[in-house]
């Protein structure tokens, strides 16, 4: 607890002090006072630098004195033998004695009193910026006229802050300009313009004179401009050292003028105005700006249009242009939007074809579609090459955006048929020799695949069963083999309108127009064992001549059994119709004269007993295409015959090509178009 005075005595005083003693006293007087410490008695063993015994006076970290030996007063009117005056309110006194004393020493007696200090004069650092007033136990600062005392109660300054400038144009000067500005002041001026305008400051060099920087280059008095996170300055010296035109890029500017105690000059004067906020002319790749201007400012709107092949993607929507507005912050709206190369995306897959995974799907990329050869070819041309166009579509030079269509190759067996003998008088065959061969199991018969969706057969095959089950791709018709082959499901049966339906089909004598089409529910996948036969052309090249050879195939009756297990085939010549008429009908159901022969029928066979028979009906009579020897076309369909092993009658398909094409077109699905 601070005291105003006190006494300090060495141990045992006035008796001799003991050896090996160390004692300290902490003196504290109230704040605002100094300490006057004086000794009235001093008798301590003398040694050089008071190394043995001593009394030490310490103020803070400073040793004020170290005493030893004997002292007596120089003034007969005063008992004081030694005294100390410190301007601080704390003092430490430390007494030390060593292990031996050659004589008897009595020590010391000292007193302290609190004394007033003059803060205004007693310290190197003057506490007040202007006027200092001392009083007992303290001091106070005061200021000259027009100055005010800051909150720190020490510094005086001019009241030059708080001004807010909102006009679009204005002038600001330091206090008293052009007279010397006040010392020890901090002036803050605020310019606050409408958003979208930037503050532009203009100065003239001669309108600026501020105390110069020190030797280290630090401004003693300074002018600073602060715009958001950008700072201009500090500036000082004779003549403005910064740019005479400062574009702040902000609608808010703080001007801070700081002065110290010395070196007042005339100060400064500046003008400011609000410029609409400029937005940079950005380099946006792959695009054009409309309108094109040298400079864009607040509220300007531009349309940015992507070059061909580029688009701006916002979310999932692609557009070719967008609008951007110069905003109040000097930034363009929609600045995140960029013109990117158009992405045509993963190309669509096509039925029975493929497209290699493209390295890139961007504008200018090229892809190639191919069909699954040798079973399919590209029907609509164009070569299959597509490039990613500017509109985001894969485009072909011929087809445009239309996809290529892979359609089955017709009439080309994977393996040619070689005769080995059986059918009636024909040979064993493999389905790869006749990949168009369709098996009907009820009734037991045949048909010919003519495309993905259509089977051609004889009318008498389907007249009694409009929902036939058909199979393709198997040489054997054992149930076990058919179970592993492809079953075809009919959607609709179309019997030729010229085919006469009878109540008792077993008694039929008229097989004219014995032709029907079966529309399939699902498209057939082509391959080595399944592939269509061609239809005849309409030109005279496809008119058959006697002796022309054709191939027949099927699982009908053979010499050995009523139904063949494995596919049989035979090569037969076309014969004059009269040859068929001349054969006596086996087990006739009517008078021989009742059997009808028409130009819609082809007669074939008669050689080596080779013929079609019961169970082969509907199968193709396949003839080599006169215009493309690698292909076969269905010249006829197994229809009827007077007697197995002689001549057989076949429906002349050429006469029905128009009906076939019309029926297929009228009953196609969108997927086929």
């Amino acid at each position: 607890e601070p005291t105003m005075y006190g006494e300090i005595l060495s141990p045992n005083y006035p008796q001799a002090y003991p050896s090996e003693v160390e004692k300290s006293w902490d003196i504290e007087v109230p704040e605002g006072y100094g300490i006057h410490l004086y000794f009235t008695h001093l008798d301590i063993e003398l040694s050089e630098n008071c190394a043995y015994d001593s009394v030490q006076i310490i103020s803070g970290d400073t040793e004020e004195g170290r005493l030893c030996g004997q002292r007596s007063s120089n003034n007969p009117h005063s008992p004081i033998v030694e005294e100390f005056q410190v301007p601080y309110n704390k003092l430490q006194v430390i007494f030390k004695s060593d292990f031996s004393n050659e004589e008897r020493f009595t020590g010391f007696a000292a007193y302290y009193v609190a004394t007033d200090i003059n803060e205004c004069t007693d310290f190197v650092d003057v506490p007040c910026s202007h006027f200092c007033n001392n009083f007992i136990g303290g001091y106070f600062c005061s200021c000259p006229p027009e100055y005010f005392l800051h909150d720190d109660m020490k510094n005086c300054g001019v009241n030059c802050s708080g001004d807010v400038f909102t006009a679009l144009i204005g002038e600001i000067a330091s206090p008293n300009y052009p007279k010397p500005y006040p010392e020890n002041s901090r002036c803050e001026y605020q310019i606050r313009l409408e958003k979208g305008f930037q503050v532009v400051v203009t100065l003239r060099r001669e309108d600026f004179d501020v105390e110069a920087a020190d030797s280290a280059g630090n401004c003693l008095d300074s002018l600073v401009f602060v715009a958001g996170d950008r700072q201009f300055g500090p500036y000082c010296g004779h003549g403005f050292p910064g740019p005479l035109n400062i574009e702040t890029k902000s609608n808010a500017l703080d001007i801070i003028f700081q002065t110290d105690l010395t070196g007042q000059k005339k100060g400064w004067k500046l003008r400011y105005h609000g410029d609409p906020m400029p937005c940079p002319k950005e380099d946006t790749p792959n695009s054009v700006w409309e309108p094109a201007k040298a400079k864009y400012v607040f509220r300007d709107v531009v349309q940015i249009t992507c070059l061909d092949g580029f688009e701006v993607v916002e979310g999932r929507v692609g557009a070719t242009s967008f609008y951007s507005t110069c905003q109040s912050n000097g930034k363009w709206s929609n600045s995140k939007l960029k013109c990117q190369p158009v992405d045509c995306g993963i190309p669509e897959s096509i039925e029975n074809g493929k497209v290699e995974d493209p390295e890139s799907t961007l504008f200018g990329s090229v892809i190639r579609y191919t069909c699954e050869e040798p079973y399919y070819y590209m029907e609509n041309g164009g070569g299959g090459e597509y490039h990613c166009a500017g509109n985001g579509s894969w485009v072909n030079e011929v087809l445009g955006p239309e996809l290529p269509k892979c359609v089955p190759v017709c009439g080309v067996p994977r393996e040619p048929f070689e005769e080995k003998q059986r059918i009636i008088g024909g040979s064993d065959a493999d389905i790869k020799n006749f990949p168009w061969q369709v098996f009907f199991d009820n009734p037991w018969a045949g048909g010919a695949l003519i495309n993905e969706y259509w089977v051609l057969t004889a009318a008498h095959v389907v007249e009694g069963n409009r929902e036939p089950t058909m199979y393709v791709g198997s040489t054997s018709v054992q149930t076990s083999r058919l179970a592993k082959s492809k079953m075809l499901t009919p959607e609709h049966v179309f019997i030729h309108p010229g085919w006469k339906l009878l109540e008792v089909p077993e008694g039929r004598t008229n097989f004219d127009n014995d032709i029907a089409l079966v529309r399939l529910k699902d498209p057939v996948k082509m391959g080595p064992t399944v592939s269509p036969i061609c239809l005849p052309g309409t030109s005279s090249d496809y008119n058959l001549m006697d002796g022309d050879l054709g191939l027949i195939s099927g699982w009908g009756r053979t010499e050995k059994r009523d139904r063949a297990v494995r596919l049989k085939a035979a090569r037969l010549p076309v014969a004059p119709l009269r040859k068929c008429k001349e054969v006596k009908v086996e087990k006739p159901t009517a008078d021989a004269e009742a059997y009808v022969f028409t130009p819609n029928m082809i007669c074939a066979g008669g050689e080596k007993g080779m013929d079609s028979c019961k169970g082969d009906s509907g199968g193709a009579f396949a003839v080599q295409d006169p215009n493309d020897k690698t292909k076969f076309y269905a010249a006829g369909l197994v229809s009827w015959g007077p007697q197995c092993g002689t001549y057989g009658l076949y429906t002349r398909v050429k006469n029905y090509v128009d009906w076939i094409m019309k029926t297929m077109q009228e009953n196609s699905t969108p997927r086929e178009d």
């Epitope: 199991d441 018709v477 179970a483």
Partner: antibody
């Protein structure tokens, strides 16, 4: 050469069990249905059981229904007849025979074109 | 079950004779019928399938006919090796059933 060889016959007490086997060779076994036919001493032929090419469909004579079970292992080219609860009237020469099945949903059976030599089963106490 | 009635149960004939064996079904079986020949101590052998189709390798003196419920096996000229027991088999529906057999003996 197409061949069927039966085995597994023997003498068994009434109520006992026996398993007959038929080993096939010379043809693609899993393309054909198979049948068991028996002939009691001095009597006529009696069809016992049949199975289709993949084993999914079976049939039995009323006299053996619930006691006999026909099965096949196409990987082993083998046909089996498991006979349980045997009776004296089951005593017979048991033949296995091959059945040809043609066609798809509408099929055509050509039964018993090839026969084995038979194996004898005697049920006696 | 379909009953197959075969007649006669036995017959005596001479070499060169024309022999006819009949089989009657208890209900219509279309043409789902086969004829089998069995010689003593041997396994049966198929002669005819689907009523009228001659099994491959069987002599043409054997023929079959009929449809529905009435079926016939004919041996146009009996040969010494033809003396055997003949069975019909209906294959129309499970359970398959054989006729009782016809034993052809030398007169």
């Amino acid at each position: 050469e197409v061949q069927l060889v039966e085995s597994g016959g023997g003498v068994v007490r009434p109520g006992g069990s026996l398993r007959l086997s038929c080993a096939a060779s010379g043809f693609t076994f899993d393309d054909y249905g198979m049948s068991w036919v028996r002939q009691a001493p001095g009597k006529g032929l009696e069809w016992v059981s049949g199975i289709n090419w993949e084993g999914g469909s079976t049939g039995y004579a009323d006299s053996v229904k619930g006691r006999f079970s026909i099965s096949r292992d196409n990987a082993k080219n083998s046909l089996y007849l498991q006979m349980n609860s045997l009776r004296a009237e089951d005593t017979a020469l048991y033949y296995c025979a091959r059945d040809e099945q043609l066609g798809g949903l509408k099929y055509y059976y050509y039964y018993m074109d090839v026969w084995g030599k038979g194996t004898t089963v005697t049920v006696s106490s | 079950d379909i009953q197959m009635t075969q007649s006669p149960s036995s017959l005596s004939a001479s070499v060169g004779d024309r022999v006819t064996i009949t089989c009657r079904a208890s209900q219509g079986i279309r043409n789902d019928l086969g004829w089998y020949q069995q010689k003593p101590g041997k396994a049966p052998k198929r002669l005819i399938y689907t009523a009228s189709n001659l099994q491959s390798g069987v002599p043409s003196r054997f023929s079959g006919s009929g449809s529905g419920t009435e079926f016939t096996l004919t041996i146009s000229s009996l040969q010494p090796e033809d003396f055997a027991t003949y069975y019909c088999l209906q294959t129309n529906i499970y359970p398959l059933t054989f006729g009782g057999g016809t034993k052809v003996e030398i007169k």
